[in-house]
């Protein structure tokens, strides 16, 4: 038989951040290889990662075609050295993945504070708009382009001299906050999709950025500081 001693894949798991989407599975192959297929609920199966000895397959190119669709993948197991045979009618063992809807399930990547600028007692904080691999009319879209108003940012800010944090929220990538004159502040932002009710509702916090430091002055803290 063409599938002798092959083991079906298991623990199929979607790993997705900002729409970069990889399907992972087990086991590490011994004398076998894998091929992955992906489809939408109503579409045809498309094969990817042909006869690979890896236990992961990058499916980003497929899911970015429509991030609001629901996708299903399956992983076929073949004997090592397998060559596609036109005469073979026996279906190799395979396992289905959980369903995956990128728009609802991709994790939000760690955001970055692009800049901050103080004018009097106001500070304008700008969050970098991350690019995704989602396209429209041959143009790559940013995270904001894809999620629109479904995506908000939360800003955490505090005086360098104290630990009491304040928060602000925005439907754009900009904040304009009131600060005390002569005080230095630190900032961190978090991306949030409020309409989600699952663990992937929030990103991790951005690296902290602080006012009043020359670039590189606080290298030992692991933080990169903007100077304005």
């Amino acid at each position: 038989s063409g599938t002798t001693n092959t083991v079906a894949a298991y623990n199929l798991t979607w790993k997705s951040t900002n729409f970069k989407t990889i399907l992972e599975w087990e086991p590490k192959p011994i004398n076998q290889v894998y091929t992955v297929q992906i489809s939408t609920k109503s579409g045809d199966w498309k094969s990817k990662c042909f006869y690979t000895a890896d236990t992961e397959c990058d499916l980003t190119d497929e899911i970015v075609k429509d991030v609001k669709q629901t996708y299903l993948a399956r992983v076929f197991s073949y004997p090592a050295g397998h060559v596609e045979s036109t005469g073979s009618t026996e279906e190799p063992p395979y396992e289905n993945s959980p369903e995956f809807t990128p728009y609802l399930e991709t994790n939000l990547g760690q955001p970055t504070i692009q800049s901050f600028e103080q004018v009097g007692t106001k500070v304008n904080v700008t969050v970098q708009d991350e690019w995704t691999l989602v396209r429209r009319n041959d143009t790559f879209l940013s995270l904001r382009d894809v999620f629109g108003k479904d995506l908000i940012y939360t800003l955490y800010y505090w005086k360098s001299s104290s630990s009491g944090k304040k928060t602000a929220k925005t439907n754009t990538n900009e904040f304009l906050i009131d600060v005390d004159k002569g005080e230095n502040y630190c900032f961190s932002v978090q991306a949030v999709i409020p309409s989600r009710r699952t663990a992937n509702r929030k990103s991790t916090d951005s690296p902290v950025e602080c006012m009043g430091h020359e670039k590189g002055e606080s290298r030992e803290t692991g933080h990169h500081h903007h100077h304005h």
């Epitope: 629109g148 108003k149 800003l155 929220k169 925005t170 904040f175």
Partner: antibody, heavy 125, light 108 residues
């Protein structure tokens, strides 16, 4: 000064598709605002239909979602509404509006600050 | 969906009087997303107040908004003849965005 103008047929037959276009003048449709459709049934209140960003990102009213498509044409500075399988209950004045960011409480939030004059659509055979 | 209930349905007042319009939400609304609009017959709505209490540019200071959570109020301190119209509250924080049923302020 941004201005919006709705256009499209004033009479649509039942079961057909209602198609309206909103032309944006005095500003770019790609300038960081959202673009909305709202309707008002005769003598009644306002109902939000949906919105679109220049990138094509949309949000729809769930009660209409299965019948609604909003699209954007950045080259023409226009956005459009299609409402399929219409009935007499879809007879209304249809407005397009700009959803622009305003500063509030440390951040920016979107409000419908510029509206078209509205166009009356009657569904009747 | 969040249901916004406005009261009273109609308010009959004379020019110079104070108008107090109420908007009650079926669940808590973030003030950042609460707006008030004015609509006159045959015209499109006009944004008056956003963020529950901030006047839109060009709106006279006789208009003021207040409230939080589920209870919001629009106050017109001294009614001018051009203020007689229908007023709508709206929430734009949760899809579907919803409007209240409106309060008609008419001349007594």
């Amino acid at each position: 000064q941004v201005q919006l103008q709705e256009s499209g047929p004033g009479l649509v037959k039942p079961s057909q598709t209602l198609s309206l276009t909103c032309t944006v003048s005095g500003g770019s449709i790609s300038s960081g605002q959202y673009w909305s459709w709202i309707r008002q049934h005769p003598g009644k209140g306002l109902e939000w239909i949906g919105e679109i960003y220049y990138s094509g990102s949309t949000r729809y009213n769930p009660s209409l979602k299965s019948r609604v498509t909003i699209s954007v044409d950045t080259s023409k500075n226009q956005f459009s509404l299609k409402l399929s399988s219409v009935t007499a209950a879809d007879t209304a004045v249809y407005y397009c509006a700009r959803d622009a960011p305003y500063y509030y409480g440390g951040g920016y939030y979107y409000y419908m600050d510029v509206w078209g004059k509205g166009t009356t659509v009657t569904v009747s055979s | 969906e969040i249901v916004l209930t406005q009261s009273p349905g109609t308010l009959s007042l004379s020019p110079g009087e104070r108008a107090t319009l109420s908007c009650r939400a079926s669940e808590s609304v973030d003030s950042s997303y609460l707006a008030w609009y004015q609509q006159k017959p045959g015209q499109a709505p006009r944004l008056l107040i956003y963020g529950a209490s901030t006047r839109q540019t060009g709106i006279p200071d006789r208009f003021s908004g207040s409230g939080s959570g589920t209870d919001f109020t629009l106050t017109i301190s001294r009614l001018e003849p051009e203020d007689f119209a229908v007023y709508y509250c709206q929430q734009a924080g949760v899809v579907p965005y919803t409007f209240g049923g409106g309060t008609k302020v008419e001349i007594k």
